[in-house]
């Protein structure tokens, strides 16, 4: 039968590390993490680190008995836990039989947003008490509401990360611009900028209803390949809303017109 | 049945490179590292490196790491192993060996003698 | 890089003889042993792999035993055919290496 692994916490010294090994399995190969959503109930999901590990093809595989895994995350709260994963069988070759090597991976350890993490790995049995323990490290970044698995954690839809409101922004002449959006449904109030080194046009807007909506902005300076910031205020993120940015582009001809006055908001400037 | 065919004898001048081939055949060649032993008249057998056809992972014995390039293509089941700068102690019978579970080599090709002589 | 030091170098013995080759390691190569057979003009075969197991077509008159460093092949009564050159190999991780050889002659 093939290995597998079955795993679980531990957080102190692994048992074997008090044991005088005379010899003990090489270090690890590989180390890669990525980020995975798991549903935790409906509406609710849990972003967790898949951490995949690839072992050295070499007979000190054979010694293997587990892969122990460290998490530590560095933020505002410091955090650290370890998980072991036990190998199931011994391995009776130095490849998996269809080829390739032999990769194993772990789903757990929560990730908190735009946090900075120190992902350790090691074999056990692994070096003597006195001796340098192989062992293979990554850091890992945690991404923000933006990333695509991020988006569906419960902080990030509250600040509105999967509304998409879907910016386009085009210069009308030298002295306006003209910006669309899709309204969230969550909030009616939102702030535009026009951005280059320096704010070239804002404007704020009031928006009831769930529509598309367009918004012409007067802007003081040369306005093609600014920058447009969005910003939403919502009734659960209030100011601290994700903000949405797009680009400013020159008009076609068959660009959407500029709604009548009474849809058409310019207030600020 | 498996077996491992390589490319005839090759004649050499100092300085020059040698590409030796292997075919396998019989086996899922992505599934086992394919290794390259010399053999020198009269002499032991020297492990030169391995490689992981799956992956093209390699790994080769320091005395050679400078000279030896091994490759494979998985669409045809073959393993090359190049040897360049090449001097006169080069002349040797070069052999591909399929790994077993582990690196006993289980499978050897008819070897493939490379004189290398001004 | 882990030696392996083969005695004898070469022996003279007739059929019928129980002949013992031995193969040290200069570390603990945990069982991961192999042995060849090499005739003049051919490849090696493979006999034995982790010390002791025979691999597919070999006569049971092979057999090899040892641990740690030090490793014996056996021929337990030597055939005509037996008549040839003796590796060990460790493969406890690269990079292999072979014994000097064993040449097994006719007395």
């Known amino acids: 039968r093939e290995p597998t692994i079955q795993c679980g916490s531990e957080t102190g010294p692994s048992p074997e590390w008090m044991v005088q090994h005379t010899l003990t399995p090489g270090d690890l190969r590989d180390l890669q993490v990525e980020l995975v959503k798991t549903s935790v109930a409906a509406e609710e999901f849990s972003i967790l680190m898949n951490i995949s590990w690839i072992l050295r093809a070499d007979a000190s595989i054979r010694l293997l008995k587990a892969t122990k895994i460290c998490v530590s995350g560095k933020n505002n709260m410091n955090s650290y836990s370890c998980v072991r994963c036990n190998y199931t069988e011994a391995f009776q070759s130095q490849t998996r039989p269809s080829g390739g090597k032999w990769t194993f991976s772990y789903v757990g350890f929560p990730v908190e947003l735009s946090t900075l993490y120190l992902i350790s790995a090691h074999n056990i049995p692994n070096a003597n008490m006195n001796e340098d323990s192989p062992s293979l490290s990554v850091n890992f970044t945690s991404p923000g509401c933006l990333n695509h698995v991020m988006k569906y954690k419960k902080q990030c839809t509250e600040a509105g990360s999967l509304w998409d409101p879907d910016i386009t922004a085009c210069k009308k002449n030298e002295k306006m611009v003209e910006v669309n959006f899709t309204t969230n449904p969550l909030g009616n109030r939102y702030t535009i900028l026009i951005q280059r080194d320096t704010t070239l046009g804002f404007s704020r807007v009031l928006e009831n209803k769930l529509m598309r909506t367009s918004v012409a902005i007067p802007v003081t300076e040369e306005s093609e390949g600014a920058v447009v910031q969005l910003t939403p205020y919502l009734h659960t993120c209030g100011n601290d809303c994700i903000r949405r940015e797009g680009t400013v582009v020159l008009c076609s001809e068959t660009s959407a017109p500029i709604p009548p006055d009474d849809n058409r908001r310019m207030l600020g400037g | 049945q498996v077996q491992l065919v390589q490319s005839g004898a090759e004649v050499k001048k100092p300085g020059a490179s040698v590409k030796v081939s292997c075919k396998a055949s019989?086996?899922?060649?992505?599934?086992?590292?394919m290794n390259w032993v010399r053999q020198a008249p009269g002499q032991g057998l020297e492990w030169m490196g391995r490689?992981?056809?799956?992956?093209?992972?390699?790994q080769y014995n320091q005395k050679f790491k400078d000279r030896v390039t091994m490759t494979r293509d998985t669409s045809i089941s073959t393993a090359y192993m190049e040897l360049s700068r090449l001097r006169s102690d080069d002349t040797a019978v070069y052999y591909c060996?399929?790994?077993?579970?582990?690196?006993?080599?289980?499978?050897w090709g008819q070897g493939t003698l490379v004189t290398v002589s001004s | 890089d882990i030696q392996m030091t083969q005695s004898p170098s070469s022996l003279s013995a007739s059929v019928g003889d129980r002949v013992t080759i031995t193969c040290r390691a200069s570390e603990n190569i945990n069982s991961n042993l192999a042995w060849y057979q090499q005739k003049p003009g051919k490849a090696p075969k493979l006999l034995l792999y982790?010390?002791?197991n025979l691999a597919d077509g070999v006569p049971s008159r092979f057999s090899g035993s040892g641990s740690g460093t030090d490793y014996t092949l056996t021929i337990s009564s030597l055939q005509p055919e037996d008549f040839a050159t003796y590796y060990c190999q460790h493969f406890w991780g690269p990079p292999y290496t072979f014994g000097g050889g064993t040449k097994v002659e006719i007395k």
């Open positions: 982790d010390v002791t």
């Open positions: 019989g086996y899922t060649f992505i599934s086992y590292w």
């Open positions: 060996a399929r790994s077993g579970g582990f690196d006993w080599f289980a499978y």
């Open positions: 490689i992981d056809p799956y992956d093209s992972e390699i």
